[in-house]
């Protein structure tokens, strides 16, 4: 059996020892349970010397980042892909991962995830722009493609534990977060629950047991606890704004 290793990291999707699986938020763990230490990528970085992190897919980036070519011109022409900052509400997008947590990509625009989109039986038309070197590219010729996907959605939203690919696959109050073998629908965190504070840096490995994000009106903040000796070991919890 591999030895347990303790690691304290604020890296997004870094792989500390597994923990907190059943209701996890994308990002690394703050509190750590014994387990296997999985290899990550880069060592810790500060914002001062932040380097763009090369990636092959969105999962290698933070939950507030997505994987893409830094300029459209470079896409599909051997241009390296890096983790880019997620796009805020009403910004243009090509897929869900480009939008910041709590948003999803609809008709090429980042929209708030209110779980009312894609109602059962509705015909949903999404414009997806595929770049040749992009994460979900259908064509390999390096030129942008615009495809209108029309799909009738008859299935019910995923319940807790259902396998998903994105949060829009999950029922209200759930998000899609990694749980090792796959991503599954997990509960959005409530007030007082342990959360993961995201930072745009760190050892960009992959966290396999993620937590969901904090629910509406809540923010992930350091728990005010005078018994904690150092900031690095403090728990973050979902707190009212």
């Amino acid at each position: 059996t591999l030895n347990s290793v303790l690691i304290n990291s604020n890296a997004i999707k870094n792989l500390p020892p597994p923990l907190g699986g059943a209701g996890g938020q994308p990002g690394s763990a703050v509190s750590v349970a014994p387990g296997v230490l999985y290899e990550g990528g880069n060592k810790y970085q500060t914002l001062d010397n932040y380097q763009p992190y090369p990636c092959a897919e969105d999962e290698e980036c933070g939950s507030d980042e997505y994987c893409s070519s830094p300029s459209r011109g470079a896409a599909g022409v051997g241009g390296v892909q890096i983790c880019l900052a997620c796009r805020k509400r009403r910004k243009r997008c090509m897929r869900h991962a480009m939008c910041c947590p709590g948003n999803y990509c609809k008709n090429g625009i980042c929209m708030p995830s209110d779980h009312s989109h894609f109602p059962r039986g509705e015909i949903e038309e999404s414009i997806i722009e595929n770049l040749g070197n992009d994460h979900n590219a259908a064509a390999g010729d390096g030129y942008p493609r615009r495809t209108t996907l029309t799909s009738k959605i008859y299935h019910t939203k995923g319940q807790e534990g259902s396998v998903c690919l994105r949060s829009s696959d999950c029922a209200a109050g759930l998000c899609c977060a990694r749980h090792f073998w796959s991503k599954i629908c997990k509960p959005v965190l409530k007030e007082g629950q342990v959360c993961t504070k995201h930072k745009r840096k760190g050892s960009h490995g992959l966290e396999i047991f993620q937590r969901c994000y904090c629910g509406e009106g809540l923010a992930c903040r350091i728990q005010k606890d005078h018994h904690q000796a150092s900031n690095s070991s403090r728990l973050h919890t979902c707190q009212r704004h």
């Epitope: 597994p18 923990l19 699986g21 059943a22 014994p34 807790e160 534990g161 990694r178 749980h179």
Partner: antibody, heavy 112, light 112 residues
Framework: EVQLVQSGAEVKKPGASVKVSCKAS????????IHWVRQAPGQGLEWMGW????????TYAQKFQARVTMSRDTSSSTAYMELSRLESDDTAMYFC?????WGKGTMVTVSS | QAVLTQPSSVSGAPGQRVSISCTGS?????????VHWYQQLPGTAPRLLIY???NRPSGVPDRFSGSKSGTSASLVIAGLQAEDEADYYC???????????FGTGTKLTVLG
Amino acid sequence: EVQLVQSGAEVKKPGASVKVSCKASGYTFTDYYIHWVRQAPGQGLEWMGWIHSNSGATTYAQKFQARVTMSRDTSSSTAYMELSRLESDDTAMYFCSREDYWGKGTMVTVSS
Amino acid sequence: QAVLTQPSSVSGAPGQRVSISCTGSSSNIGAAYDVHWYQQLPGTAPRLLIYVNNNRPSGVPDRFSGSKSGTSASLVIAGLQAEDEADYYCQSYDNSLNAYVFGTGTKLTVLG
């Protein structure tokens, strides 16, 4: 250290039921799912289903839907898998798994 | 018919490089579900070798690597060693079966 300790080998007659246990330690039991996977002698791995250790919610592979029951006891951090109406081809090693950690397996032999 | 197909056996001499394929379809690997690889020595539980397509747990030598493309995945073992002789399984999720699925398994023989 994360450990999943399974119950001992069982010999059952066709038509009977078997209940295999999996005791977890070294982590917060209710934070994870427990999966059950079986392997017949000389054969490959076959996923049977999972149980959410906290809520007790289950999902079973269609093949086992009518015969399997997964349960858990949070007070003892133990998961259970019961398979009923046993047939000879249910003879297999049954593993419990936390996905990243696996138990050593419980051999169930079905023989008349 | 198996959902994830692997060659039943592969072999190589010590020091050689071998590749094990895992062929799926648009409802599993091709649907963007992750692939994991397990090594199983005789009489033991599966051991995680590669997780989420191409990541290695600590303790797994860097001779082992994984990749995924389209509807298939591959496990490459560079610099074969005698202790690599084992069964290897790929694993993913299939959305048409609503089940986690394992590959058919590949027996690796190290010659000499």
